[in-house]
């Protein structure tokens, strides 16, 4: 669901504004990195610096939910196994990949099994 604007109370009994409404962090260039967040309170506006992380893991956050297949067999050559995820639900404004591939190292047990299988195949 598209996130509602975060509402932040401005402290201090003497402050004119009781509640600031902050918009999303908008990167200054491209779709991640340093940018600005605009806040409004009555007729007042403020801009504060913010950062949208550029790491690939962003696609795996709450913005994008995937339905994953079971893990594939261990690849003895790379020592990893793979599974694919299909997009299940995206936040309205989140530009999620339709499918993603996740890899992880094989456990020592599956590594040994994969090596044993490889060895048998060579005989």
């Amino acid at each position: 669901v598209a996130k509602k604007k975060d509402k932040v109370k401005k402290g201090g009994p003497g402050s004119e504004c009781a509640e600031w409404a902050w918009g999303p962090c908008t990167p200054s260039s491209k779709d991640c990195g340093v940018g600005f967040r605009e806040g409004t309170c009555g007729a007042q506006t403020q801009r504060i610096r913010c950062r949208v992380p550029c790491n690939w893991k962003k696609e795996f956050g709450a913005d994008c939910k995937y339905k994953f297949e079971n893990w594939g067999a261990c690849d003895g050559g790379t020592g990893t196994k793979v599974r694919q995820g299909t997009l299940k639900k995206a936040r309205y404004n989140a530009q999620c990949q339709e499918t993603i591939r996740v890899t992880k190292p094989c456990t020592p047990k599956t590594k040994a099994k994969a090596k044993a299988k490889k060895g048998k195949g060579k005989d």
Epitope: K4, K5, P24, T86, L87, A90, Q95
Partner: antibody, heavy 117, light 107 residues
Framework: QVQLVQSGAEVKKPGASVKVSCKAS????????MNWVRQAPGQGLEWIGM????????ILNQKFKDKATLTVDISTSTAYMELSSLRSEDTAVYYC??????????WGQGTLVTVSS | EIVLTQSPATLSLSPGERATLSCRAS??????LHWYQQKPGQAPRLLIK???QSISGIPARFSGSGPGTDFTLTISSVEPEDFAVYYC?????????FGGGTKLEIK
């Protein structure tokens, strides 16, 4: 690519209800938000609300909270919008559209609902 | 709710001319602004998403700018098939809202 085919035109009497369907084919129906938009004759576009087929999460324009009910049937890849207590002001073309922030959207051909006594 | 004001209401141009359509939001909507084209008897067609992102299958003469409160749709050289009504829509907060439209007509 997604194709959306809507049900045919309807003529209803004031006070009646109508259920408009929107059948999807092509890419996964259940992954994308389904919007409903209306357009009165000679007027602009007005957003009614949306539903996500994966869990039926619904967000309605408050203006339509007592007017529209959105549902989906995953088994047939069909979205439905039921309009109740129809009035002449509800005469409009009603559109469904499947939205993905990554690829954009696809629209149905529209369903004309005429409310007349 | 966020109000989108489009200007001009009507734009009269000849084919080959440059079209500049404006959409102003009542508050900052980041880049969550989309442009649609609608021809009589047809469903709207998405031209630009998120202020400036192009859409597959849409001619390169259509471009958009933003973000913030002031957005522009530019048609670099108007073709005969571009005469239609253009709407902007915001998806920054609920309810989603559309502008009142700009009618691009032949001069």
């Amino acid at each position: 690519q997604v194709q959306l085919v809507q049900s045919g035109a309807e003529v209803k009497k004031p006070g009646a209800s109508v259920k408009v369907s929107c059948k999807a084919s092509g890419q996964s129906f259940s992954s994308y938000w389904m919007n409903w938009v209306r357009q009165a004759p000679g007027q602009g576009l007005e957003w009614i609300g949306m539903i996500h087929p994966s869990d039926s999460e619904t967000i309605l324009n408050q203006k339509f909270k007592d007017k529209a009910t959105l549902t989906v049937d995953i088994s047939t890849s069909t979205a439905y919008m039921e309009l109740s207590s129809l009035r002449s002001e509800d005469t409009a073309v009603y559109y469904c559209s499947s939205w993905s922030a990554k690829r954009g959207d696809f629209w149905g051909q529209g369903t004309l609902v005429t409310v007349s006594s | 709710e966020i109000v989108l004001t489009q200007s001009p209401a009507t734009l009269s141009l000849s084919p080959g001319e440059r079209a500049t359509l404006s959409c102003r939001a009542s508050e900052s909507i980041s880049n969550n602004l989309h442009w649609y084209q609608q021809k009589p008897g047809q469903a709207p067609r998405l031209l630009i998403k998120y202020a400036s992102q192009s859409i597959s299958g849409i001619p390169a003469r259509f471009s958009g700018s933003g973000p913030g409160t002031d957005f522009t749709l530019t048609i670099s050289s108007v073709e005969p098939e571009d005469f239609a009504v253009y709407y902007c829509q915001q998806s920054n907060s609920w309810p989603l809202t559309f502008g009142g439209g700009t009618k691009l007509e032949i001069k």
